[in-house]
């Protein structure tokens, strides 16, 4: 059987000879050289060599436990002559013993960490970790202890865990933001002779809201012209806050002052400035100076710092309104006037009034914007603003005239303003009614008396207030002995009725009926329209079959005896 124990070998051997490991030996070995010892497995023939006659094993190279702590090899004892094993192949272990040849190494060369400013003493910042490649199961070669080399009295480190904590009360970022801490890790439990490594921890204090906003001055003064429209920025104010980020965000508001309704303050998120803007139209002539109380406050407040005082500040803003030479102002935004269409030239329609709002009260002159009255239908008295006609009007041509009147300061022609005038032309009964269409109808030869052969409609260009009322009648010259009658329906329509039984187209092929249409307005207007009635042959249903061909071709050359 084999005779050996586990082999142990000290790492990092520095001797000049090969390092002796141990001896493989079989009790079958008679010592006569008849056995050959063979080594195989981890490092055999390279790291470990065997004297094949004696079984002595040597290490040829310096071994590092941290690279490989255990080597597993196999041993054979073989009869040199026959190759026959005298023992079963057996596995054995060479264990490398540790020496303290590795310093602790931090997982990072440089750590970065943050901790809020004003943190309580003992607040966790970061944990650093150093590892030692030496054997943790043997001695203290890998027992690491942490200590702080640089960074006191601000920070401390727990010797066992490497946890870095704050060590000083009220560390203020606004005073100092960056700290460089150097931590040492030493093996051998920190004892003398232990190996050590260091790391740098860059610690940044993060901001908390421990500073209120402050205006650098108590009073601000701005000027703005009275003409500034709503939304016009008139000045910027800025409170400063020693904090950063959202802790330095500022909201501005107007809390008091007679300009409370006239001005607004908006916060510029980029610059953290308060922009004073015009809220309502200003009038120098009414009020020349406004004062406002503007407040700057932090929107996000940490309750634990409220003892430091309110997280807001206020300043007075004085706004001076500057006079502006303003254009004349009309008494109305628009004027609506009316005039009858039968008005004579130079008829006055109405008047406009404009005044200079400035204290100087400069006189104004009036004119018509000719781009809006190309036909020069209207004119204006430049002194008093009276509007009058300069041409005859016709409602039926144009109902509304939209013109623009200009008021200009006499002393400063650059100052002018405009107003729209809407002139409505009122109706006058100056148009006679007439047929709605050209009427050409027919009557059947076999028609019976009082048969309706056509309904008449009339139109009138006028637009009477109470609506149209038309009356229809045969012209006096045709009234007696007519073959047809006109029946007024009293609804602005009339019917043509047959007056006899039967018509002979060979005797009379066409009748022309003169019809008088009158309106009911003042003065009464009337016109005469002619209705053409042709005599046609019809079927028994009354449908036209044929008419006198000439009636279609020469209606004017026909007899007028109706």
């Amino acid at each position: 059987s084999w005779m050996w124990n586990q082999f142990f070998l000290l790492e990092e051997y520095t001797g000049s000879d090969y390092q002796y490991v141990g001896k493989l030996h079989s009790d079958q070995d008679r010592g006569d050289g008849s056995l050959k010892y063979i080594l195989s497995g981890d490092g055999a023939g390279d790291l470990f060599i065997i004297n094949e006659n004696t079984g002595d094993i040597q290490a040829t190279k310096r071994l590092d436990r941290e690279e490989k702590p255990v080597y597993i090899l196999r041993a054979q004892a073989i009869n040199r002559r026959t190759g026959r094993p005298v023992e079963p192949e057996s596995e054995f272990i060479i264990k490398i013993h540790d020496i303290n040849d590795n310093e602790p190494i931090f997982t990072k060369e440089v750590y970065t960490a943050t901790v809020p400013e004003m943190s309580d003493v003992g607040t966790f910042v970061v944990q650093v970790t150093a590892t030692d490649a030496d054997d943790p199961t043997y001695g203290n070669s890998a027992k690491v202890v942490y200590s702080i080399l640089q960074g006191q009295p601000y920070f401390s480190v727990e010797s066992e865990t490497g946890i870095i904590k704050t060590a000083l009360l009220n560390m203020d970022r606004e005073n100092r933001e960056q700290y460089q801490v150097v931590i040492q890790a030493k093996d051998m439990g920190g004892q003398m002779g232990g190996l050590s490594g260091t790391t740098t921890v860059n610690i940044t204090l993060t901001d908390v809201n421990d500073n209120p906003p402050r205006f650098p001055q108590s009073t601000y003064q701005f000027k703005t012209p009275e003409s500034s429209p709503p939304g016009t920025p008139i000045g910027r104010i800025k409170a400063s806050d020693a904090d950063v980020g959202e802790n330095a965000e500022i909201e501005y508001s107007i809390t008091d002052g007679e300009g409370l309704d006239m001005f607004d303050v908006i916060t510029d998120q980029e610059t953290q400035e308060g922009i004073i803007t015009v809220k309502k139209l200003l009038d120098f002539e009414k009020k020349k100076v406004y004062t406002l109380k503007v407040e700057a406050s932090n929107p996000y407040v940490e309750p634990r710092f409220l003892y430091l005082g309110p997280f807001k500040d206020s300043a007075t803003v004085r706004i001076v309104v500057e006079d502006v030479d303003e254009p004349p102002v009309f008494s109305k935004l628009a004027y609506i006037l009316q005039i009858r269409e039968d008005a004579q030239i130079n008829t006055t329609i109405g008047s406009v009034t404009a005044q200079d709002p400035d204290a100087a009260r400069n006189p104004v002159k009036y004119s018509v914007d000719r781009h809006t009255d190309m036909d020069r239908i209207f004119n204006i008295d430049s002194g008093n603003g009276s509007i009058f006609t300069s041409k005859l009007l016709d409602r039926e041509t144009l109902l509304w005239h939209n013109i623009t009147v200009i008021a200009t300061e006499i002393n400063n022609p650059k100052q002018s303003s405009r107003v729209p005038l809407y002139i409505k032309v009122l109706d006058v009964n100056d148009n006679a009614p007439e047929f709605a269409e050209f009427y050409e109808t027919f009557v059947c030869e076999k028609a019976k008396a009082d048969q309706l052969i056509q309904t008449l409609h009339a139109v009138d260009k006028d637009d009477p207030y109470s609506g149209h009322q038309f009356s229809f009648s045969l012209a006096p010259e045709a009234a007696s002995g007519s073959n047809f009658t006109i029946q007024d329906n009293k609804d602005n329509t009339a019917g043509i009725l047959t007056r006899k039984n039967g018509y002979n187209r060979h005797e009379m092929s066409t009748y022309l009926l003169p019809v008088v249409i009158s309106d009911n307005d003042y003065p009464v207007q009337s016109s005469t329209g002619t209705v053409t009635v042709r005599v046609c042959a019809c079927d028994h249903h009354g449908n036209m079959q044929s008419c006198h061909a000439e009636a279609l071709i020469h209606p004017t050359g026909l007899s007028t005896g109706a």
Partner: antibody, heavy 117, light 111 residues
Framework: EVQLVQSGAEVKKPGSSVKVSCKAS????????MHWVRQAPGQGLEWMGD????????HYTQKFKDRVTITVDKSTSTAYMELSSLRSEDTAVYYC??????????WGQGTTVTVSS | DIVMTQSPDSLAVSLGERATINCRAS??????????MHWYQQKPGQPPKLLIY???NLESGVPDRFSGSGSETDFTLTISSLQAEDVAVYYC?????????FGGGTKVEIK
């Protein structure tokens, strides 16, 4: 380079003896056993015996035990095989071969021994 | 004595084809996982040449188309792809006990 160089061919009378030499070079002669193997014409290989040069320990096959003697001269790294009482069936090529763990890893070129009256 | 029986006596194989030679020992030649069986190649007019030792280990310088396997009493030499230069007689040999004995040989030819 390992080399085994054998002596030349021999023609022998029946009943006589023959001594074949094998000179080794290219390795430590004492560290390896030397074997002798013969091959009759058209036949297979037949192991005859071996010797440990360091102790001159020998092993012979039963068939040749009484007629074969294997010796060495360590000073010249030469092994010898002597076969006595030769008969015609001893006509064969005789090889020396280096032994290592039961295998023959190097062989001599062979010596032809002819036994004829 | 341990008798070594080789089969077949001769073998004709096409170039590039597999050749398999068997060797049976009259008793086990294995001990402690070591198989004391070796294979040789002999070409006409030349001494034998070691191919495989301890049943499956390829001797240095021998092409890897040669391989050996087996244990106890049954062993095999395989030529995976026969080449022209592989024409020879192949012998098995045991070193398990004295006297060391050889098989009768197998002649390998090209078909």
């Amino acid at each position: 380079e390992v080399q085994l160089v054998q002596s030349g061919a021999e023609v022998k009378k029946p009943g006589s003896s023959v001594k074949v030499s094998c000179k080794a070079s290219g390795y430590t002669f004492s560290n390896y056993w030397m074997h002798w193997v013969r091959q009759a014409p058209g036949q297979g290989l037949e192991w005859m015996g071996d010797i440990d040069p360091s102790h001159s320990e020998t092993h012979y096959t039963q068939k040749f035990k009484d007629r074969v003697t294997i010796t060495v001269d360590k000073s010249t790294s030469t092994a010898y095989m002597e076969l006595s009482s030769l008969r015609s069936e001893d006509t064969a090529v005789y090889y020396c071969a280096r032994g290592d763990l039961g295998r023959f890893d190097y062989w001599g070129q062979g010596t032809t021994v002819t036994v004829s009256s | 004595d341990i008798v070594m029986t080789q089969s077949p006596d001769s073998l004709a194989v096409s170039l590039g084809e597999r050749a398999t030679i068997n060797c049976r020992a009259s008793e086990s030649v294995s001990i402690h996982g070591t198989h004391l069986m070796h294979w040789y190649q002999q070409k006409p007019g030349q001494p034998p040449k070691l191919l495989i030792y301890a049943a499956s280990n390829l001797e240095s310088g021998v092409p890897d188309r040669f391989s050996g396997s087996g244990s106890e009493t049954d062993f095999t030499l395989t030529i995976s792809s026969l080449q022209a230069e592989d024409v020879a007689v192949y012998y098995c040999q045991q070193s398990f006990e004295d006297p060391w004995t050889f098989g009768g040989g197998t002649k390998v030819e090209i078909k």
